[in-house]
């Protein structure tokens, strides 16, 4: 099921899937002076089932001066490097996505795609945080928040992270950083 | 729980235009597409169009391009749409429904076009 | 635009039947397949999305299936408060375009 929201915001983080459940949706954005191709997909699906997963239909964008051209889906270097997303540009840790069944890949990117790409995720989805360059963790607990179904209703959990500027000190002396792998906690869902 | 909350009934002449806002609460407005829909008195729906309010970027129905202008205020958290020489083929309830696959709707709004 | 037709436009069922809507697209739209309930007062919902893909919130009876063009909603043990009018709607590319409706009434 959908999560009728998105993880929760950290001041001075962002977060990161470090793979998409199947069921999770990215809507076809183009940027500035592009639009979507005409009978162009409103959104590309993670589909499949537990042993491969991969995603449904592509996102493509055109010229608005050019409405019907079709630009292929390549990316252009120059064009990758402005592009920010809400989610962190390095992964934390290597996971190779391939090897959690039931989810998909980062999609790749598509030529003049938008600045920021929007994720809509389901049920059992966990992102990861970490903080901009410039500021440092300072954890309580993991940092990760994990879409859950409560009592009929979704909320995502709070990520215990704290993110401070480098010459602030730690609120919480001798703290250490937990070794989070990307299964570390069960995807689960709450029945009441 | 998400919510959207659409303005009152509009009463209006033929020739004159009328917006009609959508106010939304629950979740974050920036993140989802917003729709408009139109439904004329036990006729099917029609896609007017939709607005990112993230970025303002618009999309629209043929048929209303020159019809319905979509904005939003992030601020607000309010979608809006105007419509715009108004006839009697207009008077219909108007629907905001926000996301990518169309999700939540609001209760929809009522627009009488009579002289 | 892609078309979208519902054949049946109004059905009558018994409490407890199971029901199924129909609904075919004038060309393949590879899944991307919503099933809307709306109410008597104009209440508007999204049931199934992608086929087959049950909305938070919604009881285990509905059900959706389908591919390519041809595609269905079924209800497997009919409630009262199911009684209202269904459309389909494909959201694959734009403009979304509807069904024309199936209302659903009680015998």
């Known amino acids: 099921e959908l999560c009728d929201d998105d993880p929760p915001e950290i001041p001075h983080a962002t977060f990161k899937a470090m793979a998409y459940k199947e069921g999770t949706m990215l809507n076809c954005e183009c940027k500035r002076g592009f639009r979507r191709i005409k009978s162009g997909s409103l959104y590309m699906l993670c589909t499949g089932n537990s042993s491969h997963s991969s995603w449904d239909n592509q996102c493509q964008c055109t010229s608005s001066a050019t409405r019907n051209t079709t630009k292929q889906v390549t990316p252009q270097p120059e064009e990758q490097k402005e592009r920010k997303t809400t989610e962190m540009q390095s992964p934390m840790q290597p996971v190779d996505q391939a090897s959690l069944p039931g989810h998909c890949r980062e999609p790749p990117p598509w030529e003049n795609e938008a600045t920021e790409r929007i994720y809509h995720f389901v049920v059992g989805q966990m992102v990861y945080y970490q903080c901009v360059q410039g500021y440092r963790a300072l954890h309580r607990g993991p940092a990760e928040s994990v879409c859950k179904m409560t009592h009929g209703k979704t909320r995502w959990t709070q990520p215990q992270l704290i993110c401070t500027g480098e010459m602030e000190t730690s609120q919480f002396p001798g703290e250490e950083k937990p070794q989070a792998s990307p299964e570390g906690r069960p995807e689960s869902e709450t029945s009441c | 729980d998400v919510q959207l909350q659409e303005s009152g009934a509009e009463l209006a002449k033929p020739g004159a235009s009328v917006k009609m806002s959508c106010k939304a609460s629950?979740?974050?407005?920036?993140?989802?597409?917003m729709h408009w829909v139109k439904q004329r008195p036990g006729q099917g729906l029609e896609w007017i169009g939709y607005?990112?309010?993230?970025?303002?970027?618009?999309e629209y129905n043929q048929k209303f391009k020159d019809k319905a202008t979509l904005t939003a205020d992030k601020s607000s958290s309010t979608a809006y749409m105007q419509l715009s020489s108004l006839t009697s083929e207009d008077s219909a309830v108007y629907y905001c429904?926000?996301?990518?696959?169309?999700?939540?709707w609001g209760q929809g709004a009522t627009v009488t076009v009579s002289s | 635009d892609i078309q979208m037709t519902q054949t049946t436009s109004s059905l009558s069922a018994s409490l407890g039947d199971r029901v199924t809507i129909s609904c075919r697209a004038s060309q393949d739209i590879s899944n991307y397949l919503n099933w809307y309930q709306q109410k008597s007062d104009g209440t508007v919902k999204l049931l199934i999305y992608y086929t087959s893909r049950l909305h938070s919130g919604v009881p285990s009876r509905f059900s959706g299936s389908g591919s390519g063009t041809d595609y269905s909603l079924t209800i497997s043990n009919l409630e009262q408060e199911d009684i209202a009018t269904y459309f389909c709607?494909?959201?694959?590319?734009?403009?979304?375009?509807f069904g024309g409706g199936t209302k659903l009434e009680m015998k």
């Open positions: 429904a926000r996301g990518t696959v169309v999700d939540y």
């Open positions: 709607q494909q959201g694959n590319t734009l403009p979304p375009t």
């Open positions: 629950g979740y974050t407005f920036t993140r989802f597409w």
């Open positions: 607005i990112n309010p993230s970025t303002d970027y618009t």
